[in-house]
Interface confidence: low
Amino acid sequence: QTSVFPPEVILPRGGSVKVNCSASCDQPISLGMETPLPKKEILPGGNNWKMYELSNVQEDSQPMCYSNCPDGQSSAKTLLTVYWTPERVELAPLPPWQPVGKNLTLRCQVEGGAPRANLTVMLLRGEKELSRQSAVGEPAEVTTTVPVGRDDHGANFSCRTELDLRPYVLKLFENTSAPHQLQTFDLPATPPQLVSPQVLEVDTQGTVVCSLDGLFPVSEAQVSLALGDQKLNPTITYGNNSLSAKASVKVTAEEEGTQQLLCGVMLGNQTQETRQTVTIYSFPAPNVNLTKPEVSEGTEVIVECEAHPRAKVMLNGVPAQPPGPRAQFLLKATPEDNGRSFSCSATLEVAGQLVHKNQTRELRVLYGPRLDEKDCPGNWTWPENSQQTPMCQAWGNPLPQLKCLKDGTFPLPIGQSVTVTRDLEGTYLCQARSTRGEVTREVTVNVLSPRYE
């Protein structure tokens, strides 16, 4: 009977082990070991035993001890199991952005490692174990699928191997891959809301607002706003899970016509877009022409209003006949027309909307000077010592200067409150003078003396 000790050994790859072969009889005819491994007999042995050192053990092996005793030949094997940790543990790269609510597949590759029966592969989120599987194949590939939520943004995923040799060597060998950080995002299926004018006049400023709710993480979202080829530069306001991009837009004559307004919200590797049509138009204010802006009373004046060829005009509230871009009328200037406004209103239809422009001109009528009985009475009779205010109003454009003098020197205090005395009595010559000439009028003041009883 041949014995071997130890009957079973677990050792690191490239390691050495001492094995004792012994025979059951005292003086065996022969005693030895058969193995392809490098072996060295450790001397001195005994009559019926030998000790061998096996070195550089690279793989599992079963060296055999044999002995030849008088009662027969026998053999016994020792089982050498080699262990080594994997040479590569690698988590496949994660997508640059992972949509919330979609499952994420984690894939780990493990090269090498033995004994495979004791090798386990785990997929981790941080330190939390998501999946634990045996290493099968070379390289071993392990996958698991996990649901992704908003709270996975920034989470680290990794792969870890465990070579569990307990209780043989009382040791657990761990290899961990480099962690990969996940970036999640949530972009709603609804397109952004775009608020903008449907029509925009050349050389005026409009405001465009693009907003979208339900974004995560909102701080990573990007907004692109463009009108035709013109990229807009929005100010972005971030809310809890929403953003609002506001931009001013000014258009030039070259952009006249129909333009596409585009708002795109980019998050992760996805985009949500909204398009809207904006009609850009040019509409100068109408022209109001007077044959002369300043005329003398009695002069004929032509008032003319002209607008954009496609516009319809109204002159002083009266529509053109037939409706169109031009209207006019004729008037004979009177003093009442001085300072009169002639207003032209033009209406243009742009993309189903009516837009309006106005222009106003004022007529100056030169007349006078005038002194009328109504405004400058020829006779006043006042009691002595009473309080009176002499009134005399001259009319004309330009406004005349008025003087009322008695005997060419004594003035009547027009528009001032005076105490009536005897000195005030008499006839005054009132003279109204402007660049257009002068008119005169006599005004008599009578003073009534009180009666003494």
Epitope: G126, D151, Q181, Q183, F216, N240
Partner: antibody, heavy 119, light 112 residues
């Protein structure tokens, strides 16, 4: 509006444990994580760790492992921080704050819970 | 751990002045996705910190436009264009590119 309401001040003896709470309202609690921050005179502000309100996953600052335990109760929208084997070093103000998992900033904070450890 | 160093420790200003606070990190805060996860918080006396600016230069909702942030890598700055009385308190910078998340020691903005 978003609010994080923390439990009241605590005065405890050395060696015992304490559990403070943080109740979220005004937003979808499970869409965010809850971070815990310690404010002390000696160390200013220190990040203790983060817990996912959705899955309960945690990530601790190595310094607070064994000292702090974070838990969450989704049904009541409440996160908890338990501090064990208290010493005077643990006397501080503890804040909860709403944030993303790791990358995002803390956009809303609780009012803070003052912990005094004294014999 | 990433060490965040703020300067100055104390910043005396007159109302209406411009204020500038610096924050340096011991490692680059550029994440593999290209972003710098550097944030600024203001803590007023007896209150919890409040978020002012996230990811270097983005103002949180409701924060006045007199606050602005800049920088990249390891050097960052918070500027207040015209200091108002309500701006007084302790300003903290914080990074969330690396775990554990860390804070600066704080800069106290006070009246001269």
């Amino acid at each position: 509006q978003v609010q994080l309401q923390q439990s009241g001040p605590e005065l405890v003896r050395p060696g015992v444990s304490v559990k403070i709470s943080c109740k979220g309202s005004g937003y979808t609690f499970i869409d965010y994580a809850i971070h815990w921050v310690k404010e002390s005179h000696a160390k200013s502000l220190e990040w203790i760790g983060v817990i996912s309100a959705y899955s309960g996953d945690t990530n601790y600052n190595q310094k607070f492992k064994g000292k702090a335990t974070m838990t969450v109760d989704k049904s009541s929208n409440t996160a908890y921080l338990e501090l064990a084997r208290l010493t005077s070093e643990d006397s501080a103000i503890y804040y909860c704050a709403r944030g993303g998992w790791l990358l995002l900033s803390f956009d809303y904070w609780g009012q803070g819970t003052t912990l005094t450890v004294s014999s | 751990d990433v060490v965040m160093t703020q300067s100055p420790l104390s910043l005396p200003v007159s109302l209406g002045d411009q204020a500038s606070i610096s924050c340096r990190s011991s490692q680059s805060l550029v994440h593999s996705n290209g972003n710098n996860y550097l944030h600024w918080y203001l803590q007023k006396s007896g209150q919890a910190p409040k978020l002012l600016i996230y990811k270097v230069s983005n103002r949180f909702s409701g924060v006045p436009d007199r606050f602005s942030g800049s920088g990249s890598g390891t050097d960052f700055t918070l500027k207040i264009s015209r200091v108002e009385a309500e701006d007084l308190g302790v300003y903290f910078c914080s990074q969330s590119t690396h775990v554990p998340l860390t804070f600066g020691g704080g800069t106290k903005l006070e009246i001269k």
